[in-house]
Interface confidence: low
């Protein structure tokens, strides 16, 4: 049986500090009490706590808990989720820019071409837009697509220019020759290699950084248990009970019960600093062919380059296709 | 020769960016970032102590509280006695991470593992198959320009990147991040309840 | 295949008694805390008690504070329900749930009952 | 005791987009929520707000914004044609249930 409280003690600081937590006073006691109720904060002798300050308390507790590990986590979510947010839309201006640049491209040198490839360049570049955002397309077909649009309508409109528009027939013809025949060269496979590369290096950038966010979020939003709560009750709080307001928690008690409460979260150190460094090294040969701004901002003048070649290689090339495709022609001139 | 496009229907504000010297281009934000989330890379494992070095504890003081009782700061009693029939700590080591956390990491270990696929050797410019095929890297030395297509007339150098990041609405210090004290922020009674 | 079975429903008079059983298989009954659920007819799900995976834990809804005790054997992978000084308003169909909790240390996630019984009925009437 | 607010039924003919409301969740805990099939025992249908069980169709999906939460069904089937209970816990981490609703499929 602990001794009796002396006879001037008070509960007062106790209750002055409470009201704080909880306005109104009818949970504290006036003077300490055995408190033999207790199940957190078990008394050695009298003490100014009762069961349900107790409760008040671990709820507060836990509280206080996933504030901090908020608040340890904020500068580190704001970092990436603002980082995550401003690669997205500078990616989406290098693809608004370099579509710019291609149409600039065929406005200023085969304006002929404008109506019909402005479209092509437009459709290319919003599949390059939706596979940096993670859609399932694949990018050599992209590729192709841009490549068999526009060699009808450079044979049509700068090779064999006699053609009528409406020769669906050929363009159908002339979409296979474009393969077959290599009738750019080398490239869209040079083209293919670049975009692939460095969409893929920005893609799994961006996926790395949202996953950064969801790894933060997910020990942001823990809830701590009970067990955790009386932990951490005992350790901030007990000592009110006993009238010891201004005392605080030692050092090393306090880092035992954090380790005891956050077990789970430590465990994920090993693979966010793992995910860090690999971060770096993709970063890090993120140049040149790995880096979309420099690929896409000059494929203006590589897409230039195809058109040359076919240019250079027109006379071949449409006594070939008016081999291949000759059927197709004869229907058209009917 | 390609007709360089810049005075055709682009963003006049953006051509003007992209020959501004001083201006960060993308891989020198992403390089900045990278440097920062470097100083969160003992994020996890410093957790615990970062709480404790934020929440009230004993610092300068002689007595301090170690859950049932009062006693001096270096004393034994200090991280022991309060621990008693609370919780095994030898136990909890040798649990394995509960299922929510391994669903994170897993996510992790996945990402870890694309990351490090794509991360490629430094020094390559273009795959072999493709050197082999008659594109060369041409002039264009490491400490040049980046270069982009074939050799001949089509060559034509990117100078210095775009620097978008002129052009983007987004200041991205991350000294003026809310709650960058990293203070707990009582958001009224009910948490304020720290008493120092 | 995870499963859970409660047995022990029946028709009580009121102020009697009844102990309603659970008998799970197909997971590792002592790493989750268990819970009882009610549906009295033609209402809906009310929260009656849980205990914690080691048993150590118990938790009750004010209705049946007092009266209801929850206890489980985790040799037996049973958990039980122990229904004292019934009332008409405890007639209800129970059931017993699987915590969908996940515990480290101290910190818990708290994800629902991923696992439910079939339920066994339980009438109070005189 | 804290109290989940739910509408008593909502309706919606097969292929149509229907949403369940639930309100007054105020401890922060994440929102759960359950489909009972008449006559059967509930099933956990969406946890931790916005995460589907296996065997649990894409076409039902939750969502949370402070004290409410909701669970939208999309391309609506005559199956799921059932009660939907939401679930949360109370300060103490006790669990509490929604009134439920009634989905009439049209």
């Known amino acids: 049986q602990p001794p009796p409280p002396p006879p001037d003690a008070t509960c007062h600081q106790v209750r002055s500090f409470f009201q704080r937590l909880q306005p109104g006073l009818k949970w504290v006691p006036e003077t300490p009490v055995p408190g033999s109720d207790l199940q957190v904060c078990l008394p050695k002798g009298p003490t100014c706590c009762s069961r349900k300050m107790e409760e008040k308390y671990q709820l507060t507790a836990r509280l206080n808990m996933e504030q901090l590990l908020q608040s340890a986590s904020m500068e580190l979510k704001f970092l990436i989720i603002q980082n995550a947010a401003v690669f997205q839309e500078a990616f989406e201006i290098v693809v608004r820019h370099a579509k710019n640049y291609t149409n600039a491209m065929f406005k200023n040198n085969y304006p002929s071409l404008t109506p019909q490839a402005f479209e092509f360049v437009g459709e290319f570049f919003t599949d390059v837009s939706l596979y940096i955002l993670g859609s399932d397309i694949n990018v050599d077909d992209m590729v192709n697509e841009l490549f068999d649009s526009l060699f009808p309508v450079i044979y049509t409109q700068l090779m064999n220019p006699g053609l009528p528009d409406s020769a669906l027939d050929i363009n159908e013809c002339l979409r296979g020759a474009r393969r077959d025949l290599k009738v750019f060269g080398n490239f869209p496979k040079l083209i293919m290699t670049q975009v692939s590369k460095s969409l893929q290096v920005t893609r799994i950038f961006l996926q790395a950084l949202n996953l950064g966010i969801e790894v933060i979020n997910t020990t942001d939003h823990l809830k701590f248990s009970k067990d955790c709560g009386r932990m951490l009750t005992r350790m901030w709080y007990c000592s009110y009970c006993q009238g010891l307001m201004m005392v605080k928690p030692c050092g090393g008690y306090c880092n035992v019960v954090m380790q005891g409460c956050m077990a789970g979260v430590v465990e994920i150190d090993k693979y966010w600093r793992e995910y860090i460094l690999s971060l770096e090294e993709l970063v890090n040969g993120m140049y040149r062919i790995y880096d979309m701004e420099n690929v896409l901002l000059g494929l203006f003048s590589t897409i230039h380059d195809s058109i040359q070649y076919v240019q250079k290689n027109a006379g071949k090339l449409t006594t070939t296709i008016g081999k291949l495709c000759a059927h197709s022609q004869q229907r058209q001139y009917r | 020769s390609a007709y360089y496009p810049e005075d055709l229907f682009i963003d006049k504000k953006v051509l003007k960016v992209a020959h501004v010297e001083h201006e960060e281009t993308l891989s020198s934000r992403r390089r900045e970032l990278i440097q920062k989330l470097k100083s969160f890379i003992s994020f996890y494992s410093a957790l615990p102590g970062y709480i404790c070095s934020h929440s009230p504890v004993a610092e300068n003081d002689t007595l301090c509280w170690n859950g049932q009782e009062l006693v001096e700061r270096y004393s034994q009693k200090a991280a022991r006695n309060g621990m008693k029939n609370q919780f095994n700590l030898h136990e909890l080591k040798m649990k394995g991470p509960e299922p929510v956390v391994s669903q994170i990491i897993d996510k992790l270990k996945h990402i870890n593992q694309l990351l490090r696929t794509m991360s490629m050797p430094k020094g390559r410019v273009l795959d072999k198959n493709l050197d082999e095929e008659g594109f060369e890297s041409g002039d264009c030395g490491d400490d040049e320009d980046e270069c982009i297509g074939g050799s001949g007339d089509g060559m034509i150098k990117v100078k210095n990147q775009l620097r978008f990041l002129a052009e983007l609405a987004y200041d991205l210090d991350v000294d003026d991040a809310p709650g960058n004290s990293q203070q707990a922020t009582p958001k009224d009674n009910e948490i304020s309840t720290f008493h120092n | 295949e995870v499963q859970l079975v409660e047995s022990g429903g029946g028709l009580v008079q009121p102020g009697g008694s009844l102990r309603l059983s659970c008998a799970a298989s197909?997971?590792?009954?002592?790493?989750?805390?268990m819970s009882w659920v009610r549906q009295a007819p033609g209402k809906g799900l009310e929260w009656v008690s849980n205990?914690?995976?080691?048993?150590?834990?118990?938790y009750y809804a004010d209705s049946v504070k007092g009266r209801f005790t929850i206890s489980r054997d985790n040799s037996k992978n049973t958990l039980y329900l122990q229904m004292n000084s019934l009332r008409a308003e405890d007639t209800a169909v129970y059931y017993c749930?699987?915590?969908?909790?996940?515990?480290?240390?101290?910190?818990?996630?708290?994800?629902?009952?991923?696992?439910w019984g079939q339920g066994t009925t339980v009438t109070v009437s005189s | 005791q804290s109290v989940l607010t739910q509408p008593p039924s909502v309706s919606g003919a097969p292929g149509q987009r229907v949403t369940i409301s639930c309100t007054g969740s105020?401890?922060?805990?994440?929102v759960h929520w359950y489909q009972q099939l008449p006559g059967r025992a509930p099933k956990l249908l969406i946890y931790?707000?916005?995460n589907r069980p296996s065997g649990v169709p894409d076409r039902f999906s939750g969502s949370n914004s402070g004290t409410s939460a909701s669970l939208a069904i999309t391309g609506l089937q005559a199956e799921d044609e059932a009660d939907y209970y939401c679930?949360?816990?109370?300060?103490?981490?006790?669990?509490?249930f929604g009134g439920g609703t009634k989905l009439t499929v049209l």
């Open positions: 749930a699987k915590e969908y909790d996940y515990k480290t240390g101290w910190m818990h996630y708290y994800y629902g009952m991923d696992v």
């Open positions: 105020s401890s922060g805990y994440d």
């Open positions: 197909g997971f590792t009954f002592e790493g989750y805390a």
């Open positions: 931790g707000s916005n």
């Open positions: 679930q949360s816990y109370d300060s103490s981490l006790n669990a509490i």
């Open positions: 205990v914690s995976g080691s048993g150590d834990g118990t």
